[in-house]
Amino acid sequence: MMTGTIETTGNISAKKGGSVILQCHLSSTMAQVTQVNWEQHDHSLLAIRNAELGWHIYPAFKDRVAPGPGLGLTLQSLTMNDTGEYFCTYHTYPDGTYRGRIFLEVLESSVAEHSARFQIP
């Protein structure tokens, strides 16, 4: 039975040209995480972290995607085209597969600064 839950960073925004960390966390289960896949909005694979084989970043994203922290993924040099959904897929034993969703909005620098100025501390 799958008792775990995936907690994600949810909906996040970041500045064009900046970087952002995509994080998922699996909780409420003792299952062993064997692999984590990170997919982009069009379901193309960005990266895989296999417990026994390590990280593999898809070559097309190599210059803009960094592994970590932890099982997360860091996207760098953000463009407006990076706006959209991102999915983490956790393969676990014995539970099976858990999936989490993050929505990233990339903002023009001036917009990001404007929205940040009015955030409640």
């Epitope: 064997t34 296999n50 417990a51 084989l53 593999h56 097309a60 190599k62 034993y93």
Partner: antibody, heavy 117, light 107 residues
């Protein structure tokens, strides 16, 4: 077009080290993908040996971990296999291959290595 | 290690026939299975990865299916260039392992 080519001695004496080079053309080994060694035994069995990543990290098959080393020379776009303490059971055709998410999309032609005194 | 059991070990067929090769895996590998073709004296060539995605340049008469522990490769309307050996390989954990192969021969 990416191409891989294995080279090295075809005959190695028992207890010595086997050293092979894979020359990669048409793609930089630091630009992504992993770079693997695989061998094909006379009995038609394929065995994955290990790989070096574009950043130089290595992962080895547990059964070979104690006697294998994979390194690279990024200036020459080469990567290397060194297998220590060989026996006749290491006689095989050795392939280098490019790996994407741990399957192999480009292979070298292979080089046959015989271990014999 | 994850064990890969391929069947049949050998198979005779004629041009135009349809054949299926199966690969049984000792534990759940989800969809992380690849298929290769190898001709005599040549290196293996990737046909399929992630169970059903055809590699670049592979004809559509090849198709992969399955999930978990049971997988198959189907070749429709066999062509003369399809004869040779076929291997499955999981791409899920260390060590990466291959099946023992299926030799497809001309009847």
């Amino acid at each position: 077009d990416v191409q891989l080519q294995e080279s090295g001695p075809g005959l190695v004496k028992p207890s010595q080290s086997l050293s092979l080079t894979c020359t990669v053309t048409g793609y930089s080994i630091t630009s992504g993908y992993d770079w693997h060694w695989i061998r094909h035994f006379p009995g038609n069995i394929l065995e994955w040996m290990g790989y070096i990543s574009d950043s130089g990290n290595t992962i080895y098959s547990p059964s070979l971990k104690s006697r294998i080393s994979i390194t690279h020379d990024t200036s020459k776009n080469h990567f290397f296999l060194k297998l220590n303490s060989v026996t006749s059971e290491d006689t095989a055709t050795y392939y280098c291959a490019r790996g994407s998410f741990w399957y192999f999309d480009v292979w070298g032609a292979g080089t046959t290595v015989t271990v014999s005194s | 290690d994850i064990q890969m059991t391929q069947s049949p070990a050998s198979l005779s067929a004629s041009v135009g026939e349809t054949v299926t090769i199966t690969c049984r895996v000792s534990e759940n590998i989800y969809s992380y299975l690849a298929w290769y073709q190898q001709k005599q004296g040549k290196s293996p060539q990737l046909l399929v990865y992630n169970t059903k995605t055809l590699a670049e340049g592979v004809p559509s008469r090849f198709s992969g299916s399955g999930s978990g522990t049971q997988f198959s490769l189907k070749i429709n309307s066999l062509q003369p260039e399809d004869f040779g050996s076929y291997y499955c390989q999981h791409h899920y954990g260390n060590p990466l392992t291959f099946g023992a192969g299926t030799k497809l021969e001309l009847k």
